[in-house]
Interface confidence: medium
């Protein structure tokens, strides 16, 4: 399987709500043994390998706001945590999946992966993720509402396995 | 710079509880698992457990399970190997190191310097 | 468990010469999904921790000079130290990561001929 990024910058206004999105490509093993997560977490640019670097969302991390399921399956996170700090992860029956970040700031700019593991049961991990930036702007330059700007080709179908 | 900073070397007697640490710094503790690894003397590399910082879960060799206890406080970015009642087989090296897994068991890409434990009556 | 096993337990080479470490599996580790092995390698100097050199079984982990290489697939791994340097005298461990408990192998000392 692959996961794909629609969009690779995101550029919003202080203050506005957005949703960064993701796409898992590609069959998935649907095995009894075999489970299924999506998840997201910050990281930075510059590193040898993007995304290899994990950092929270407003605190929360990658096991705070993951989903588990068997594949592609609906499923949100309804938790108080995550919507305690204005953020909600979801994802839909064709594998799409998204993570919405409400009454963005300054201080949420900065790159964002979404990441899918598939683990069989007593084995190690099978991960692919997609990364996307987010650029949150105040001033008179400022948009209205986010502009999104599409992935090249290339780009949404860099896919990293690790 | 991510840092692993472990407590420094023990001497006990046999019976003795004992609880080691390991403090993280330079990356984000709460998104890294933490393993330990035995090294007895002049011996190789044993993989003893895991912890999740971020929620305290926790996976053990089934070689160490039930004689040692995994733990770790997220407030100040440290995990802990403890024993209850310590033998002298226990005399070893132990070192933490951060593995690299989302939900449990990798590569281990940074140690800390290790924590002699001897224990002799 | 997954055993891991060294060949040889020491070697001996000349500065400048290849040095080759054996690892063998109980069972293959390599993982279907993603046609990976969940394989590492580890070096470890006197009196010091372990370092990560390898991982993926050939992927050098970040400033690791590039005289180290990883090499095999399934259950048959091989580290190569193409020109033994001073500093590389350590013990080498391999590690797989495809299933817990995580398994180490015995170690093979290399030290200069």
């Known amino acids: 399987f692959k996961v794909a990024t629609p969009y690779s910058l995101y550029v919003c206004p202080e203050g506005q709500n957005v949703t960064l999105t993701c796409r898992l490509l590609g069959p998935v093993d649907k095995g009894h043994d075999v489970t299924f997560y999506k998840t997201w977490y910050r990281s930075s640019r510059g590193e040898v390998q993007t995304c290899s670097e994990r950092r929270p969302i407003r605190n929360l991390t990658f096991q705070d706001l993951h989903l588990h399921h068997g594949g592609h399956q609906a499923a949100n996170t309804s938790h108080d945590l995550a919507q305690r700090h204005g953020l909600e992860s979801a994802s839909d029956h064709h594998g799409n999946f998204s993570i919405t970040m409400r009454n963005l700031t300054l201080l949420d700019s900065g790159l964002y992966c979404c990441l899918v593991v598939e683990i069989r049961h007593h084995h190690s991990e099978h991960r692919v993720h997609g990364a996307m930036e987010l650029q949150v702007q105040t001033g008179k330059d400022a948009p209205s509402n986010c502009v999104v700007y599409p992935s090249s080709s290339q780009d949404s179908e860099n896919i990293t396995a690790a | 710079e991510v840092q692993l900073v472990q407590s420094g070397a023990e001497v006990k007697k046999p019976g003795e509880s004992l609880k080691i640490s390991c403090k993280g710094s330079?990356?984000?503790?709460?998104?890294?698992?933490i393993g330990w690894v035995r090294q007895m003397p002049g011996k190789g590399l044993e993989w003893m457990g895991i912890i999740y910082p971020g929620d305290s879960d926790t996976r053990y060799s089934p070689s160490f399970q039930g004689q040692v206890t995994i733990s770790a406080d997220k407030s100040i970015s440290t995990a802990y190997l403890q024993w209850s009642s310590l033998k002298a087989s226990d005399t070893a090296m132990y070192y933490c190191a951060r593995d690299d897994a989302l939900y449990g068991g990798y590569y281990l890409d940074y140690w800390g310097q290790g924590t002699l434990v001897t224990v002799s009556s | 468990d997954i055993v891991m096993t060294q060949s040889p337990d020491s070697l001996a080479v000349s500065l400048g010469e290849r040095a080759t470490i054996n690892c063998k599996s109980s069972q293959s580790v390599l993982y279907s999904s993603n046609n990976k092995n969940y394989l590492a390698w580890y070096q470890q100097k006197p009196g010091q921790p372990p370092k990560l050199l390898i991982y993926w079984a050939s992927t050098r982990e970040s400033g690791v000079p590039d005289r180290f290489s990883g090499s095999g697939s399934g259950t048959d791994f091989t580290l190569t130290i193409s020109s033994l340097q001073a500093e590389d005298v350590a013990v080498y461990y391999c590690?797989?990561?495809?299933?817990?408990?995580?398994?180490f192998g015995q170690g093979t000392k290399v030290e200069i001929k």
């Open positions: 330079g990356y984000s503790f709460t998104s890294y698992w």
């Open positions: 590690q797989q990561y495809y299933s817990t408990p995580l398994t």
